[in-house]
């Protein structure tokens, strides 16, 4: 990119507009799942933070080579995970950063809930949430 | 090729206003951010702000509050700033830039 | 406000010597790959020159003598062999956060 680029107006408030879906996902271990971010225009670079709990701060999230990836293109910006595990449970935002601003905007979060339990705790949480 | 040109040197006496002005050509105008530095005599560069040169709306550094307005003529490609109640402490180069591009700079005196 | 310090204040160099600018910034300016911070040179009477855009990308025109590197808060302008046109002043700044700031400046001077 040229020097330049980085002083571009935002298009209107473009960069503020941030459609993330799905909105949730549940899938069984091992699977693979895709999250979107859809942006007005491309005034930003995108980036993704993660939560596990509810009450948590997202932080960024760390790619796992291989196994998580990202790619953005002029209007869409994805994450993939690959072989999903128990200890990827929890929201994934889409965060955009506009070009010329310190301006920060972020998606309404993607949940992932990782399916087959682990555990007889975990057998045992999940039909007390069913009930 | 980009050109940024800015008006002349002022000198103005305090309490008074000045209005210095930016042409841009070369480029789209409402492409890109404008942005305003100032430069006291013998001292360092300090960013005062910038205006969205498609909405019109400007934002302001701290110390650039007040009496500092940016404005647009975007029929004529040109950024403006304007200085009201001048001080002493205003004498200084101002410059336009975006990027790379920057204006030659404006120098406003402010002397009785 | 993010503050940026410059050093050394000056630096008093022969031509053919190596020049190192430092740049520390109070907090980040990265933003996921990149890091917002471009170095400047100025010269009496003269506006500001870009020299180097996020952190390591030399602008269109300059000479490959200048070169920057560094991320985070650390930040280096590195002319190789200095030149008898390169003795002047040289200012970083950082754009991922408003207000835009830009260090005190470094006067690279004949020794």
């Known amino acids: 990119a040229r020097s330049e680029d980085r002083y571009r107006n935002p298009k209107g408030s473009a960069c503020s507009r941030i459609w993330q879906s799905p909105r949730f996902i549940a899938r069984k271990r091992g699977f693979t799942v895709k999250m979107h971010c859809y942006m007005n225009s491309a005034s930003g670079n995108v980036s993704w933070l993660w939560k596990q709990e509810m009450d948590e701060n997202p932080q960024q999230l760390k790619l796992e080579k291989g196994r998580m990836e990202e790619s953005q293109n002029e209007s869409l910006a994805t994450l993939t995970i690959q072989g999903i595990r128990f200890e990827d449970n929890g929201i994934y935002f889409c965060q955009q950063k506009c070009n010329n601003t310190s301006e920060v905007y972020q998606g309404c979060g993607t949940e992932l809930r990782v399916m087959g339990f682990s555990t007889l705790a975990q057998l045992k949480q999940r039909n007390t949430l069913k009930d | 090729q980009v050109q940024l040109v800015q008006s002349g040197s002022e000198l103005k006496k305090p309490g008074a206003s000045v209005k210095v002005s930016c042409k841009a050509s070369?480029?789209?105008?409402?492409?890109?951010?404008m942005h305003w530095v100032r430069q006291a005599p013998g001292q360092g560069l300090e960013w005062m702000g910038w205006?969205?040169?498609?909405?019109?709306?400007?934002s302001y550094a701290d110390d650039f509050k007040g009496r500092f307005v940016f404005s647009l003529d975007t029929s004529v490609s040109t950024a403006y700033l304007q200085i009201s109640s001048l001080k002493a402490e205003d004498t200084a180069v101002y410059y336009c830039?975006?990027?790379?591009?920057w204006g030659q700079g404006t120098l406003v005196t402010v002397s009785s | 406000e993010i503050v940026l310090t410059q050093s050394p204040a000056t630096l008093s160099l022969s031509p053919g010597e190596r020049a190192t600018l430092s740049c520390k910034a109070s907090?980040?300016?990265?933003?996921?790959?990149?890091?917002?911070m471009d170095w400047y040179q100025q010269k009496p009477g003269q506006a500001p020159r870009l020299l180097i855009y996020s952190a390591s990308n030399l602008e269109s025109g300059i000479p490959a003598r200048f070169s920057g590197s560094g991320s985070g808060t650390d930040f280096t302008l590195t002319i190789s062999s200095l030149e008898p046109e390169d003795f002047a002043v040289y200012y970083c700044?950082?754009?991922?956060?408003?207000?835009?700031?830009f260090g005190g400046g470094t006067k690279v001077e004949i020794k």
């Open positions: 700044q950082q754009i991922n956060e408003y207000p835009y700031t």
């Open positions: 907090q980040s300016v990265d933003h996921d790959v990149d890091s917002y």
């Open positions: 070369g480029y789209t105008f409402t492409d890109y951010s």
């Open positions: 205006i969205n040169t498609e909405t019109g709306e400007p």
């Open positions: 830039y975006y990027g790379p591009y």
